[in-house]
Interface confidence: medium
């Protein structure tokens, strides 16, 4: 029955980019500007998303597909389909309710978004710290002292991973 009904329905012949216009004897009319239909057989066209304010147009609306937005410089997308724009911070910072704040000692963020994460604990893997961590970079772990045969390495064990003059917050 469904198959028979769809064959008799003139609207089923209307392709994407058009709508079945009841006011014009159900002929297929093109979607008007700023609207689209992504599937065939639709009785209305959907209004295109408008990228306003902090949103900017990444992909313009066509008669068969909606517009896509991203965020203006200094912001980044959050949520499905970039439903929100969140402020960027600098590397070494994270966004809080009071704005961008430096990462606490012992944490880092190497991106303009997201939260500060703890430095890797090299000793958990039986390794030593090869390069100290910073607010922007994780520590680099080196081979464990046992892996180094005497006199086979010129690596000097680094000082404790702490930035000079950077007190815990």
């Amino acid at each position: 029955f469904e198959r028979t009904r769809s064959l008799q329905d003139p609207c089923s012949n209307c392709p994407a980019g058009t709508f079945c216009d009841n006011n014009r004897n159900q002929i297929c009319s093109p979607c008007p500007p700023n609207s689209f239909s992504s599937a065939g057989g639709q009785r209305t066209c959907d209004i295109c998303r408008q990228c306003k304010g902090v949103f900017r147009t990444r992909k313009e609306c066509s008669s068969t597909s909606n517009a896509e937005c991203d965020c203006t410089p200094g912001f980044h997308c959050l949520g499905a389909g970039c439903s929100m724009c969140e402020q960027d911070c600098k590397q070494g910072q994270e966004l809080t309710k009071k704005g961008c704040k430096d990462c606490c000692f012992g944490t880092f963020n190497d991106q303009k978004r997201g939260i500060c994460r703890p430095w890797t604990n090299c000793s958990l893997d039986g390794k030593s710290v090869l390069v100290n961590g910073t607010k922007e970079r994780d520590v680099v772990c080196g081979p464990s002292p046992a892996d180094l045969s005497p006199g086979a390495s010129s690596v000097t064990p680094p000082a404790p991973a702490r930035e000079p003059g950077h007190s815990p917050q």
Epitope: G17, P32, P33, T57, K59, E60, C61, S62, S63, S65
Partner: antibody, heavy 116, light 107 residues
């Protein structure tokens, strides 16, 4: 930065046809409409039509439907407008412009002269 | 087709003055109007979109207002670089149409 590059001038004979080009750069070509606009000397702007390079959707001003054909070459990010059966009335500056509704970037325009 | 009527054809002002351009549509087009200026031998440049929305890089002295059939572009203090032709354009329905233009000249 966004740029639309057009040849400066074209000279063709009456009755002939011409294919005007508009090379886009600085953005994703398939994501934005390209419009074509005519301006005769001392006259107002006249919208010819537009094309969506992502799927070749086109819309035309009825006055130009038998005159202009819009196409794109995605591999070179270039939009084209083919004008046929040229007469002196087709002598004008032809601009390409990016935008679905408001036209935010424009080429420098191609001056088309139809003369024997 | 939607007809856009711009008036007057020519506006004469002195630098520093405030000036307003009018654009009237032949039918209700909501806020689907955009404003451009075009300097001599140059390409048009988008100034305002959707009647009142500002454009990045355009000086704040340019503003727009209106909805329905009557629209206005204003320059709150004209500078020498503003002397040019001004056009409105509608995107409510195809074909898009432009107004006949208003020439802003130095008094």
């Amino acid at each position: 930065q966004v740029q639309l590059q057009q040849p400066g001038a074209e000279l063709v004979k009456p009755g002939a046809s011409v294919k005007l080009s508009c090379k886009a750069s600085g953005y994703t070509f398939t994501n934005f409409w390209i419009n074509w606009v005519k301006q005769r000397p001392g006259q107002a702007l006249e919208w010819i039509g537009n094309i969506y390079p992502g799927n070749d959707n086109t819309n035309y001003n009825g006055n130009f439907k038998s005159k202009a054909t819009l196409t794109v070459d995605r591999s070179s990010s270039t939009a084209y407008m083919h004008l046929s059966s040229l007469t002196s009335k087709d002598s004008a500056v032809y601009y390409c412009a990016r935008g679905q509704l408001g036209l935010d970037y424009w080429g420098q325009g191609t001056t088309l002269t139809v003369s024997s | 087709d939607i007809l856009l009527t711009q008036s007057p054809a020519i506006l004469s002002v002195s630098p520093g003055e405030r000036v307003s351009f009018s654009c009237r549509a032949s039918q209700n087009i909501g806020t689907a109007i955009h404003w451009y200026h075009q300097r001599t031998n140059g390409s048009p440049r988008l100034l305002i979109k959707f009647a009142s929305e500002s454009i990045s890089g355009i000086p704040s002295r340019f503003s727009g207002s209106g909805s329905g059939t009557d629209f206005t572009l204003s320059i709150n203090s004209v500078e020498s670089e503003d002397f040019a032709d001004y056009y409105c354009q509608q995107s409510n329905s195809w074909p898009f149409t432009f107004g006949s233009g208003t020439k802003l000249e130095i008094k």
